[in-house]
């Protein structure tokens, strides 16, 4: 190996992970590098053998979905990319150690907000992940993070908010005025892993009082 500066071929190889969907991304130092092809390998911590990722060999795009290959959420992984230019120059770069449990970000929850006359019901739908349990079913975020809870806030007016929270999926803000618009925000929190999702936002109006 003759050392040379190949930083213009390949930079910033990293995992981008959201709800355990793990995408490997990278960049070239050049504005455009149409003659450069990329090949991806991955491995688990302490394994000697790098495995070639099928479908990500000699590609021109700068991302590769490694969700299936990195599907054990208790494992640590590495990935590396080799860039080869038409002129024969090559560069290999690897990621830092990747743990999806530690590094995945949480997307906003999927929530149904149901207005009633004097209350608003909020039903949080479980977020499934691509991770399979031993029996083959897909795990939810709740399955993976034992300490996961939901934080709900209802903006009543500029100065007053109501708060609810817990592990259950069904909530109701009560004692509201009929025929009034409210802004609800619902976030997922995983304190042990210092994770918090961006909020799901629903703007709902309580029903008019017909009595």
């Amino acid at each position: 190996h003759i050392a040379e500066d190949t930083s213009d071929l390949l930079q910033y190889v990293k995992f981008q992970s959201s709800n355990f969907e793990n995408i490997l991304t990278w960049d070239s130092g050049l504005e455009s590098a149409p003659d450069v092809v990329y090949s991806v390998e991955y491995k688990t911590y302490g394994k000697k053998e790098w495995l070639a990722k099928e479908g990500c060999q000699r590609i021109t795009r700068k991302s590769c979905n490694l969700t299936t290959e990195t599907g054990n959420h208790t494992e640590h992984y590495y990935a590396r990319v080799t860039a080869v230019s038409a002129g024969g120059r090559s560069a290999t770069k690897m990621t830092d150690r990747f743990s999806s449990m530690q590094q995945t970000t949480i997307k906003p929850p999927d929530v149904t907000c149901i207005p009633k006359v004097r209350s608003i019901q909020m039903i949080v739908h479980p977020t499934s992940t691509p991770i399979h349990a031993e029996d083959g079913h897909l795990l939810t975020l709740e399955d993976i993070f034992q300490d996961l809870f939901y934080r709900l806030e209802l903006q009543v007016n500029h100065t007053y908010q109501m708060h609810l929270g817990g592990k259950q999926r069904d909530y109701e803000f009560i004692g509201l005025s009929p025929d009034t618009e409210f802004l609800g925000t619902i976030t997922i929190s995983v304190p042990n892993f210092f994770k918090e999702s961006a909020p799901y936002v629903c703007r709902v109006k309580t029903l008019p009082d017909r009595t």
Epitope: T44, K48, M94
Partner: antibody
Framework: EVQLVESGGGLVQPGGSLRLSCAAS????????MNWVRQAPGKGLEWIGE????????TYNQKFKGRFTISVDQSKNTAYLQMNSLRAEDTAVYYC?????????WGQGTLVTVSS | DIVMTQSPDSLAVSLGERATINCKSS????????????LAWYQQKPGQPPKLLIY???SRESGVPDRFSGSGSGTDFTLTISSLQAEDVAVYYC?????????FGQGTKVEIK
Amino acid sequence: EVQLVESGGGLVQPGGSLRLSCAASGYSITAEYMNWVRQAPGKGLEWIGEINPSTGTTTYNQKFKGRFTISVDQSKNTAYLQMNSLRAEDTAVYYCARFDAYFDYWGQGTLVTVSS
Amino acid sequence: DIVMTQSPDSLAVSLGERATINCKSSQSLLYSSNQKNTLAWYQQKPGQPPKLLIYWASSRESGVPDRFSGSGSGTDFTLTISSLQAEDVAVYYCQQYYSYPFTFGQGTKVEIK
């Protein structure tokens, strides 16, 4: 064939500094983690720290954090160990060793003697 | 830090006889993800760097003679040389890679009786 060659060792006075080099050949240094391990005369092995040469991310044995710094020059395919505020007890053979968990390739080592 | 303790400190064995080195860790080295143990063994001859013999407690490094074997789980591990050869005279070290900082045992010196 993978080879690691350390250099830069020698005699240094207490309080002095030294930079050790580890030149890798037979592979791209950015393809695997690199570690530094030391061995005092007649003693056992002590892990100093590691670097991901691709990203520059380092992890240190707390014992050496602050005094020792690991870095890489990708264009030279070389890793470095910068040692500051050296003491007599830092006298040892310093090895670079490849891999992220156990160490599959080692250099021959370079001797650092801290003495006045 | 995980403390690695080897026994004995030195060992004299006749040529062709079995040599057994023990290594005990201060906490379990069982890696839950793959149910393997994060333990390696090295051989170091005078004036040379250590040489990897065994990783994952029992996987032999390529090119290492099959008279070397590793066993054990959790906190107790063993390196066995089934039939000691003259070229096996060396110091042997265990190393954990379960958590930072990686730590080594103090070494066991193997000599010929």
